[in-house]
């Protein structure tokens, strides 16, 4: 299920391919599309240009990031008068064009979401041959990625004067919300580190004291689910050493 | 920060030319269009020209065709404007404009002041 | 031929608001335009892109007192909260492609003067 958010100023037209030229070029996309990870999304982009009845060459591009600068992740060529635009780059095979770009549609499908995707996409449509013009989104259609919790990281580590700490990271978005549980510790929320820089969806909760032995659990939860790891402590008394 | 540095103030005599420059930094000009603009004392803004410094196209008001010339070097990032035949009606602080694809003229710098006098 | 007509001059109180006018020629009535500022001694700055519908996408850096509006052949830029560092002109541009000729044209200004 994909959720697109519209608002007025970017509202999405659908262009008559031989309607007389609009002024001036222009573009619509929506601020925002939802998505699951694991789903399927669709960025719409339409857009509308200043040349009358345009048939020669074009190239449509999507880039990732920024505008301009941003790398593409996708890109099609399609010949003079030919309605076909043939792919010529698809980042790991999942985009596609679902908008035919001689109708002034340039929406894609990206196939397989993960959390990495979750960035602002920008549609671009070049022309060359007699007309040589080209357009790209000023904001662009941010993609937002959506996930149940999975913890990917669980460990007990040494802290110095022979005690023992643990962390635990997880990934979802929401960022989950983490919690602990154990020994003597009832359920607790421990020290969550909040999301590290370049890693938005990525939480970790350190137990900076683990004072008996036995089982860890950390639970990571928000509002699509819950996930939960657990990690074992037993020290061998009388030593430095534990076991985990 | 996006900045356009333009070339100093320049004094010339009638049907002498000028050419002022334009040196873009923090983005690529090849991805935009250079915009000239100008504007007489007291006056309004009226434009130039553009050019689109991918392909070198340029396209020009009907008013300065034929004694304008827009040109743009890619490596140095620079645009320039030579305007020729000068009358002291081009007395006028010209602006170099970044113009987002399309119409957008999103970012001006500075001016050069070009004063046209016997 | 396109045109674009503004009234020379307006005020307003420091705090209060202003709505400006910026008037297409009438054949002309459907386009979009753009809003710049030029405060005294400097160059313009971008505002905004107005369209036919009044949706706008303001420059970076303008402060969202600045809105837009469109009513048939007029577009209108309002300043609410009027500041003192408003006092400007404000100089609306059109540019279009017609007969695959490029043109850009600008308004005569506003002069606005905060009291």
């Known amino acids: 299920f994909v959720r697109t958010k519209i608002d007025t100023t970017e509202n999405l037209l659908n262009t008559e391919v031989h309607s007389s030229p609009a002024q001036r070029w222009s573009m619509q996309v929506p601020p925002e599309v939802s998505a699951e990870a694991g789903d399927a999304a669709v960025l719409p982009c339409t857009f509308t240009h200043p040349h009358r009845h345009y048939d020669g060459p074009l190239t449509a591009i999507w880039r990732a990031g920024e505008p301009y600068a941003g790398p593409q992740v996708f890109r099609c060529a399609a010949a003079r008068g030919s309605e076909l635009c043939q792919t010529a780059l698809s980042l790991h095979g999942r985009f596609r064009l679902l908008g035919n770009p001689r109708r002034n549609d340039l929406s894609l499908r990206v196939e397989r979401l993960a959390l990495a995707d979750d960035r602002r996409y920008f549609c671009r449509v070049e022309f060359a041959g007699d007309v040589h013009d080209r357009y790209e989104s000023r904001h662009g259609v941010r993609l937002h990625v959506t996930a149940a919790p999975r913890i990917v990281n669980i460990s007990v580590l040494p802290s110095p004067a022979h005690a023992f700490r643990a962390l635990c990271t997880a990934e979802g978005e929401p960022p989950p919300a983490l919690a602990w549980s154990g020994p003597a510790l009832g359920n607790s929320l421990a020290a969550v580190r909040s999301p590290r820089e370049g890693h938005g969806h990525l939480v970790t909760a350190e137990l900076p004291a683990l004072t008996h032995d036995g089982r860890y659990t950390c639970t990571a939860a928000n509002s699509l689910g819950r996930s939960e790891a657990s990690v074992y402590l037993f020290r061998f008394h009388g030593a430095s050493g534990a076991s985990t | 920060q996006v900045q356009l540095v333009q070339s100093g103030a320049e004094v010339k005599k009638p049907g002498a030319s000028v050419k002022v420059s334009c040196k873009a930094s923090v983005f690529n000009i090849k991805d935009y269009y250079m915009h000239w603009v100008r504007q007489a004392p007291g006056q309004g803004l009226e434009w130039i020209g553009r050019?689109?410094?991918?392909?070198?196209?340029?396209k020009y008001a009907p008013k300065f065709q034929g004694r304008v010339t827009i040109t743009a070097d890619t490596s140095t990032s620079t645009a320039y404007l030579e305007l020729s035949s000068l009358r002291s009606e081009d007395t006028a602080v010209y602006y170099c404009?970044?113009?987002?694809?399309?119409?957008?003229?999103?970012?001006w710098g500075q001016g050069t002041t070009v004063t046209v006098s016997s | 031929q396109l045109v674009l007509t503004q009234s020379p001059s307006a005020s307003a109180s420091l705090g209060a608001s202003v709505k400006l006018t910026c008037t297409l020629s009438s054949q002309h009535s459907t386009y979009t335009i753009d809003w710049y500022q030029q405060q005294p001694e400097k160059g313009p700055r971008y505002v905004m892109e107005l369209k036919e519908d009044g949706s706008h996408s303001t420059g970076d850096g303008i402060p969202d007192r600045f809105s837009g509006s469109s009513s048939g052949a007029e577009r209108y830029l309002t300043i609410s909260s009027l500041q003192s560092e408003d006092e400007a002109d404000y100089i609306c541009g059109v540019g279009a492609t017609i007969k695959e000729q490029f043109v850009y044209v600008f308004g005569g200004g506003t002069k606005v003067t905060v009291l």
């Open positions: 404009v970044r113009g987002w694809l399309g119409y957008i003229m999103d970012f």
């Open positions: 050019i689109d410094p991918e392909d070198d196209k340029t």
